[in-house]
């Protein structure tokens, strides 16, 4: 008896991180024997959508003409052949940016830093959030994020880097997000250029501890009341 049908491949074009209002196409590729393709979205009634295969029957297209909050989430696809349904594909996480206003990203004490010294990148959001993501352009592992362990919402998160080396130099942006859906991100912050001077080299730089700060009282939009180390935010490299 033949083993289970091989799982299909699931991907999104132009990518899996889509700005609000932009179009995205989800592709599911199975085998030439496929008769039907099904796309399931986590926490949605299954199936989320069904499509007939496109010739030569080894893939199907699921179109999202205008990205909104409702489409953000985790997807899997299956195909049906004469012998039954396939295994599920690996999940595709479709993320929407533009769900909230852009945070602001600062470098303290300055974006000009000497190799071997310390710098902290500070990401601040307009409304309280529980996840902050730091992105470095053209990095092999660009995503670093701080997430509140207790659902405590913060207006800002700090990403300290020490000691700084030339590898830390580059262009950074940050995003913020709410715990109720990590598939919904803010607009990206304006870019911040971190310039490292000096010649100390360290091939494996890593940020140190994280710090989050609650916002001040209502009449002071972003004058924090004080820094609390860690404060419920947990660091993840992704």
């Amino acid at each position: 008896q033949a083993g289970p049908l091989p799982k299909p491949t699931l991907w999104a074009e132009p990518g899996s991180v889509i700005s609000w209002g932009n179009s995205v196409t989800i592709w599911c590729q199975g085998t030439l024997e496929a008769r039907e393709y099904r796309l399931d979205k986590e926490e949605s009634p299954a199936p989320w959508d069904r499509q007939n295969p496109l010739e030569p029957k080894n893939k199907a297209r699921f179109s999202i003409p205008s990205m909104t909050e409702d489409y953000a989430g985790r997807y899997r696809c299956y195909y049906r052949s004469p012998v039954g349904w396939s295994q599920p594909s690996d999940p595709l996480e479709l993320v929407m940016t533009g769900a909230y206003s852009k945070p602001t990203l600062s470098a303290l004490p300055s974006p000009l830093v000497t190799s071997g010294k310390s710098v902290t990148l500070l990401c601040q959001s307009r409304s309280p959030m529980d996840t902050f993501l730091l992105i470095k352009e053209r990095a092999a592992h660009p995503l670093l994020h701080l997430r509140s362990e207790h659902g405590a919402q913060q207006h800002q998160a700090e990403f300290p880097m020490s000691p700084v080396t030339s590898v830390h130099g580059g262009t950074y942006r940050c995003f913020s997000s709410h715990g109720f859906s990590h598939y919904l991100l803010s607009h990206p912050s304006d870019p911040l250029e971190l310039i490292v001077s000096g010649s100390l080299e360290d091939p494996r730089p890593s940020p140190t501890r994280s710090v989050s700060t609650a916002a001040g009282p209502e009449d002071q939009p972003l004058m924090p009341t004080g820094s609390v180390p860690h404060s419920g935010l947990r660091r993840h490299w992704e």
Partner: antibody
Framework: EVQLVQSGAEVKKPGASVKVSCKAS????????IDWVKQPPGKGLEWIGY????????SYNQKFKGRATMTVDKSTSTVYMELSSLRSEDTAVYYC??????????WGQGTTVTVSS | DIVMTQSPDSLAVSLGERATINCKSS????????????LAWYQQKPGQAPRLLIY???TRESGVPDRFAGSGSGTDFTLTISSLQAEDVAVYYC?????????FGQGTKLEIK
């Protein structure tokens, strides 16, 4: 394209109330604060308050507290501001504006409210 | 409340010349948390809504011509138009967003000489 489209001009008598609407489109409505700003004829800009559509949270300038009420209808992506106990000095253009980070990156076209007996 | 005071109230500048508008706040707008100044500049043409030009005192909004520049820190800020164009005739406002209530300057009317 982000757009904030406001309701038309209103003429009201002193003591009456007026309700101005601001319909948002072209962005994720729930995640952005909407503020209201007053501009009397030939004068400057005065901040009235904000509403956060996601939660309905509001905050008002003390000067307008008790007379201004902001509400939201998420099903139509519309924010409303009601101003009660109108007096002649409430004659102004009222703008809704989308907050970026406490500053305003998009504005409605304005609604003229005239208070006259 | 933070009081924002602009000077001059009105200004007439020849086409192609530099226009300078000043804005003074009654307390510092420089945040110790991020070393940013919580100040924005807007342009309002007759019969139109205001338009954001500058935020964080010196960051130009997308689509704003580079002849507009913001500078200053603490309590003293400047909006400079390096080479005045006919379409720059408008009233210009500064706004502080350091603390509530948000407040604006009284406006500076810019005209062609």
């Amino acid at each position: 394209e982000v757009q904030l489209v406001q309701s038309g001009a209103e003429v009201k008598k002193p003591g009456a109330s007026v309700k101005v609407s601001c319909k948002a489109s072209g962005y994720s409505f729930s995640g952005f604060y909407i503020d209201w700003v007053k501009q009397p004829p030939g004068k400057g800009l005065e901040w009235i308050g904000y509403i956060f559509p996601s939660s309905g949270e509001t905050s008002y300038n003390q000067k307008f507290k008790g007379r201004a009420t902001m509400t939201v209808d998420k099903s139509t992506s519309t924010v409303y501001m009601e101003l009660s106990s109108l007096r002649s000095e409430d004659t102004a253009v009222y703008y809704c504006a989308r907050q970026a980070f406490y500053y305003f990156d998009y504005w409605g076209q304005g609604t003229t409210v005239t208070v006259s007996s | 409340d933070i009081v924002m005071t602009q000077s001059p109230d009105s200004l007439a500048v020849s086409l192609g010349e530099r226009a300078t508008i000043n804005c003074k706040s009654s307390q510092s707008l420089l945040s110790s948390s991020n070393q940013k100044n919580y100040l924005a500049w807007y342009q309002q043409k007759p019969g139109q809504a205001p338009r954001l030009l500058i935020y964080w005192a010196s960051t130009r909004e997308s689509g704003v011509p580079d002849r507009f520049a913001g500078s200053g820190s603490g309590t003293d800020f400047t909006l400079t138009i390096s080479s005045l164009q006919a379409e720059d005739v408008a009233v210009y406002y500064c706004q502080q967003y350091y603390s509530y209530p948000l407040t604006f300057g009284q406006g500076t009317k810019l005209e062609i000489k």
